[in-house]
Interface confidence: low
């Protein structure tokens, strides 16, 4: 049929933090490049029906289903989902194509199903069918990569037994220390499984799929570097492969490297050597020690020796089960309103942990940094001086760990007041927790200096939203104070705040706040 319009159906994946149900509009979000969904004419269907390729979406992902129509004149449209009509607003792009979009924010089970788009153009009517389902991630796994020697070649293969099959990449860096951070220009990434260039300073292999990204660093002893003050330590679980690389550079080729475990030379077949000349014509040698599947008796000090360099050792510890070692006692901190402060947790763990920081039911990304002594540290500085409970949670394949922190912000009390027919209450969230006084204002005491002690009840309560403490004081109404102005004052080491309340008949009460420093 010559009159049929040219239809293009695309899926746009969004990286967004918003949450809402389907919106039929263009919605401002950070987007991935569009994926063509085909949109083929459906054979043997009554009327003109186009069918887009099935769309699989992760839970909570945000997408846009978009149709581009190359047809003359205006178009009108209607979306139908689960027998409900949804508003449809076509617009035209720079090439004068009609564009119709359906935005699905934060995909849920209820938003999965068939989305029908009915389009009416001047020439013809047609229907476009999208089928959206939630990706089943229950069977997904992401395993930490490990190394194998390539048969008959001086090369390493990086393997990650994950589902769906991961993209494997080598992350290489030839600089020292900080400049080997992931985003650094010194870092080179190679999306391949086999690596021949094994002479670099820092070699990691990473595997990524829909579940995230896991990396393994090639453990290296560099004989040209000053040995660490504490012996480097490598943990492995029984059955895992062991790889240690010893690297040395010398002015000429007249040197050799050897590996020993507890002063006994490694057996043939548990090491291999490579050498190359660097750009300045010095010789680089590397000697790998490897065990394809470690047992408990592979534990010990592995020492790399050279005829021209001081020897260096590493302690290899084989464990039956992974662990996370850290002190889990809760910690309380008290800081000033503008004081710089970070929570930190120091831990030793194997395998590497996945972690989160949580505050007020909101999770924050967790970064971890290795220290020279075999420990790692995770810091959280993004508290924005909000008082309350902060939780650090870490887990690996075999262990879990949770640590609680309380943050208190030192500040002068601020008082809020409310009153009912029978009582008046004042609240304050200052820190340290304030003390209270109630004063009666009368002809005898125009400055409100007459203290009230009868009928006062003080308490501290946890304001659940932020996990911070709120102090309150309640004054029970008595005939002696009815109709008078009373003043509640909260004070701590940083100052005092007061609120004045008129105790009369029920109804709206006028409050007057006094700030006394």
């Amino acid at each position: 049929n010559q009159d049929l319009p040219v239809i293009k159906c695309v899926l746009i994946n969004h990286k967004n933090n918003d949450s809402s149900v389907g919106k039929s509009s263009s919605y401002p979000m950070v987007s991935e490049s569009p994926e063509d969904l085909g949109c083929a004419l459906r054979p043997q269907s009554s009327g003109t029906v186009y069918e887009a390729a099935a769309v699989e979406v992760d839970v909570s992902a945000s997408i846009t289903l978009q149709v581009l129509v190359d047809a003359p004149g205006n178009i009108s449209c209607l979306w139908v989902f689960k027998h409900s009509s949804l508003n449809c607003q076509p617009h035209f792009d720079l090439q004068n194509r009609g564009v119709v979009s359906m935005v699905i924010l934060k995909m849920t089970e209820t938003q999965a199903g068939e989305y029908l788009l009915f389009i009416q153009s001047e020439a013809t009517n047609y229907t476009i069918l999208f089928t959206v389902s939630i990706r089943n991630t229950l069977l997904y796994t992401l395993r930490r990569p490990y190394f194998r020697k390539m048969e008959n070649q001086d090369a390493l293969v990086c393997i990650s037994e994950s589902v769906p099959e991961p993209i494997v990449e080598w992350v290489l860096c030839d600089s020292q220390g900080e400049s080997c951070k992931e985003e650094s220009p010194a870092v080179v990434k190679k999306e391949e499984k086999v690596l021949h260039e094994l002479f670099g300073t820092d070699i990691r292999c990473c595997a990524r799929n829909e579940l995230g990204r896991e990396c393994t660093r090639l453990f290296t002893i560099d004989l040209n570097q000053t040995p660490q003050t504490t012996l480097p330590q490598l943990f492995l679980k029984v059955g895992e492969p062991l790889w240690i690389r010893c690297k040395a550079v010398h002015v000429n080729h007249g040197f050799g490297l050897t590996w020993e475990l507890e002063n006994k030379a490694l057996e043939e077949g548990n090491y291999f050597e490579m050498s190359t000349y660097s750009t300045n014509r010095t010789m680089i040698r590397i000697l790998f020690a490897f065990v394809s599947s470690v047992a408990r008796n592979d534990t010990g000090y592995y020492t790399c020796s050279s005829s021209k360099h001081p020897s260096q050792s590493a302690l290899v510890t084989i464990v039956e089960k992974g662990f996370i070692n850290a002190t889990n006692s809760s910690e309380d901190y008290e800081i000033d309103q503008y004081e710089e402060f970070c929570f930190s947790v120091r831990f030793k763990a194997y395998p590497q942990i996945r972690c989160t920081w949580t505050f007020s039911r909101k999770s924050f990304p967790c970064e971890q940094k290795g220290l020279d002594n075999g420990y790692s540290i995770s810091k959280f500085c993004n508290h924005k001086h909000q008082p309350g409970e902060y939780i650090f949670h870490a887990e690996n394949d075999d262990a879990q760990f949770t640590k609680m922190f309380t943050l208190n912000i030192r500040r002068k009390p601020q008082v809020l007041a409310e009153a009912s027919a029978s009582q008046a209450s004042c609240f304050s969230d200052g820190y340290p927790l304030p003390s209270w006084t109630w004063k009666k204002c009368s002809d005898k005491s125009p400055n409100c200096t007459e203290e009230i002690t009868e009928g006062v009840w003080n308490r501290k309560a946890n304001r659940k939203v932020f996990g911070q403490w709120v102090s309150s004081s309640t004054l029970n109404m008595s005939e002696a104070i009815k109709g008078f102005l009373v003043k509640c004052c909260a004070y701590n080491s940083l100052g005092t705040s007061c609120e004045t309340i008129l105790l009369n008949s029920p109804g709206p009460f006028p409050f007057i706040q006094d700030n006394i420093s």
Epitope: K190, E191, V194
Partner: antibody, heavy 120, light 107 residues
């Protein structure tokens, strides 16, 4: 527009070295890898190696290891390929080609080629 | 090294024909395959990457398919400007390797 401009043809004697340059323009030089590929007369394409202009790191095909050196000058957005100990079988057209850092995107922009003739 | 084998090494066809060139890898390379077109005296031109993705600016009569070890380049309707040599190339692991080329000639 994005382009790679290579240096002119060279005639060399066996045992000598040749240094071919490739000047990039129209894109951020350090954001893409650069490959060198050669083609002997009437033959197919042969990959020689790759350089990352960002850090200067290289990876060479085993066949050329020890004879080839790839370098770059970020101030002029130029990469260089030097081949030493030339033999007659090194007579070929040498191409530089840009590639995305995610390898499977292929080599999307090529230089015009530099003919190197090795003859006594 | 991964060997790439193209077939046929040459083929004759006419304008309007549908042409298929195959490429086989000596081991699985997932979808890490590109196709190039080269005309005499010119540099190669990228047609397809990631086995099936058309490089921008390349006519839609070119298409690629396959994954693992077997790949295909198809030209749905030959045009006069399509007569050239075609190469496949893997970027799964270094060294990157090319097929030996398929020369497409006018019948």
């Amino acid at each position: 527009q994005v382009q790679l401009v290579q240096s002119g043809a060279e005639v060399k004697k066996p045992g000598a070295s040749v240094k071919v340059s490739c000047k990039a323009s129209g894109y951020t030089f350090t954001n893409y890898f650069m490959h060198w590929v050669r083609q002997a007369p009437g033959q197919g394409l042969e990959w020689m190696g790759i350089i990352n202009p960002s850090g200067g790191s290289t990876s060479y095909a085993q066949k050329f290891q020890g004879r080839v050196t790839m370098t770059r000058d970020t101030s002029t957005s130029t990469v260089y390929m030097e081949l030493s100990s030339l033999r007659s079988e090194d007579t070929a057209v040498y191409y530089c080609a840009r590639a995305h850092t995610v390898y499977y995107y292929g080599m999307d922009v090529w230089g015009q080629g530099t003919m190197v003739t090795v003859s006594s | 090294d991964i060997q790439m084998t193209q077939s046929p090494s040459s083929l004759s066809a006419s304008v309007g024909d549908r042409v298929t060139i195959t490429c086989r890898a000596s081991q699985s390379i997932s979808s890490w395959l590109a196709w190039y077109q080269q005309k005499p005296g010119k540099a190669p031109k990228l047609l397809i990457y990631a086995a099936s993705t058309l490089q921008s600016g390349v006519p839609s009569r070119f298409s690629g398919s396959g994954s693992g070890t077997d790949f295909t380049l198809t030209i749905s309707s030959l045009q006069p400007e399509d007569f050239a040599t075609y190469y496949c190339q893997q970027s799964y692991s270094t060294p990157w390797t090319f097929g030996q080329g398929t020369k497409l000639e006018i019948k």
